[in-house]
Amino acid sequence: KSSNEATNITPKHNMKAFLDELKAENIKKFLYNFTQIPHLAGTEQNFQLAKQIQSQWKEFGLDSVELAHYDVLLSYPNKTHPNYISIINEDGNEIFNTSLFEPPPPGYENVSDIVPPFSAFSPQGMPEGDLVYVNYARTEDFFKLERDMKINCSGKIVIARYGKVFRGNKVKNAQLAGAKGVILYSDPADYFAPGVKSYPDGWNLPGGGVQRGNILNLNGAGDPLTPGYPANEYAYRRGIAEAVGLPSIPVHPIGYYDAQKLLEKMGGSAPPDSSWRGSLKVPYNVGPGFTGNFSTQKVKMHIHSTNEVTRIYNVIGTLRGAVEPDRYVILGGHRDSWVFGGIDPQSGAAVVHEIVRSFGTLKKEGWRPRRTILFASWDAEEFGLLGSTEWAEENSRLLQERGVAYINADSSIEGNYTLRVDCTPLMYSLVHNLTKELKSPDEGFEGKSLYESWTKKSPSPEFSGMPRISKLGSGNDFEVFFQRLGIASGRARYTKNWETNKFSGYPLYHSVYETYELVEKFYDPMFKYHLTVAQVRGGMVFELANSIVLPFDCRDYAVVLRKYADKIYSISMKHPQEMKTYSVSFDSLFSAVKNFTEIASKFSERLQDFDKSNPIVLRMMNDQLMFLERAFIDPLGLPDRPFYRHVIYAPSSHNKYAGESFPGIYDALFDIESKVDPSKAWGEVKRQIYVAAFTVQAAAETLSEVA
């Protein structure tokens, strides 16, 4: 049955009407409007933008638009005492200092309140010492240094290149290795694509460009001072010593011009292999310390940033559902930026704005969605997903009972090559069906579907003729909805060709050069990729809110559960003797997955056949679909990560951006051969298999016939 039957409206008010109303020119105009000045979280400028969005969403026709404010811990540089790094000689004189700001891009020279590059939430400090180059500062990089090269980072300042993993994981790894400071830099190998000019002449990172970003290890906690609860007017706040996830050592980011000056003098051990070499004309020696002539020189950090409890504002818009107003489909993306936010987040915010306008237009013509749609402009995402998390904490009881789906809407583009989707398996079929109905914007695919160009350019590694859809990790505002609350979630954006472009993210990420002109000149002059992303995100929201039967296919979960069980079993089987010695068996997990597969299959058969005109039965079947994601939540959470509660997926413990499957078992098995107490370690593996098997079985039973 078609979507519009849900609300008995005229046939023209269907998905096509919604999609046809979306216009590239509007997205372009909104992006320009959102990117003329910085909108740093906690600032007056970002509050004014929140009020502007509130006013415009009301004009567009939403039923209500409210600001939801919270007082959360943020971090800012000291305006009179700038952060920098120096090389000091044996007398303590500073013979080289890193730059205090990025050279502003053309046309923005007179813009005030551009926050200089800094690592948000770095503690204050002025450590000095020898430098150790730690590559990307990944877990495996420290293993290589400490175990293979016998290099001790204790009491050293480490310098790490950005890329591969979330910067907070880099800092955590450095802390665990005993470092007393961390310098983060962007290496051209990762942030300068060959054959492309630097901004403003191209989309590459200039030598003075620097990536800002938070360095927290929140593990889903939200505001560091109020974990688990909203940072409202009567909140009880932890002391700073008990705050969640704050780094304990000073951290500062620099560009590759400054990095060159630090790295060119490095002595000590040679890099272990070519994977430790970037593209600068330096030896990439690991250290510790400088070479021969410079061996008496040290590196000194000067960090004076402060942590401050500051008010932030979410904008929450509501379009009430006509039939099931107590079922919520949420479209959310953040508004705060590090500087201008040309890509992150305003390329996403502009798309949300146009989606709201299109829904509002339909509503003004008498249409309503079957279910309620909530639109959110989140604040303080860049400071640890704070706005979305605090709002979800405040509304958790409503969300866990009423939340159907969450669609994330941060940056619409990180390239212009093909579509990229990460989502729950429940949404695979929705995404496939939708992209088959949308036109591809790609050159060479005129008249072809988005599904076809996406599948050609980004094929699934497992299923031929299908596109790659990735696991949800974290590092964005879906985290609390999916990982903590178990609300089916998804995200979509246009991306680069990962095979030919090895750089991490896009080169100008979180720099001052992320401007409107970057997008308009180099990434998407016609805004056709933005429009396609608007169609995907908006189309998903439309179907989720309007289809009579929720567009979730539980059979796709069964398929991936089997794949994930096979994968974790094969990891465990690298230790065959220990599995015998400690009686480790995966039989319970495979049995649960088999049961899930059979029950999901039977449920899908019933879904085809039931009487959709019976509102009680319809609601019952939809509730089973809605609550399936919720059934994968363990109320006790993962070990040492209580706000990551999804048993099937969690952000990797080694890279917040990446998703890991069966994370409890995975972490229990990780580096198990280095655990000094094997009996205890394998006991934890067995416990995690038990938790996973129980959870999969319990989830399966939610799909069984109710009586």
Epitope: G178, E673, V676
Partner: antibody, heavy 117, light 108 residues
Amino acid sequence: EVQLVESGGGLVQPGGSLRLSCVVSGFTFNNYWMSWVRQAPGKGLEWVANIKKDGSEKYYVDSVKGRFTISRDNAKNSLYLQMNSLRAEDTAVYYCARDIMATIIDWGQGTLVTVSS
Amino acid sequence: DIQMTQSPSSLSASVGDSVTITCRASQSINNYLNWYQQKPGKAPKLLIYTASSLLSGVPSRFSGSGSGTDFTLTISGLHPEDFATYFCQQSFSTPPITFGQGTRLDIK
């Protein structure tokens, strides 16, 4: 159950050679560093040598460098210590041991090497 | 190389007593210190790793503490089977792995 069983000890004259063997079971041998540790009669423990999982790295205490060679055969779950140019001060019980991050978590029962004329 | 010095080299105590053995490293080893128990004619057994972590199956009357250069092993309420020789060992800077000279615990 984890087991490490040494063999090859005995009486040898100064300057002579001996090869110690250790066969392990109960853990996946090729995932672990292995060590030899010795204990002279009535004395303390002295680490002798260790070898990486794949045999690519080997380390020795200064007093045995150039005389002893540690090796392994992962296919046979076996660890070896070839001892040449033996001296009276090498007399000790030699233990084969599983070494996790330089922590000795499992020990064999030991094999006695006596160097005497 | 890091030297490990244990004290006392021997001590006598009675069943039910609590005893403390100390171990000092010649330089900071953070918390990379292990304690072993050895009975006559037997191989040593690991008791405590990373200064204070009790190995599975080791009775809770054994505890370890310390960091940097100074460490202690405490046995609270001696049992007859606890009379043995105890060795500390550093796993911070290796090779070489180095042990203390041992502390013999006898029945008074």
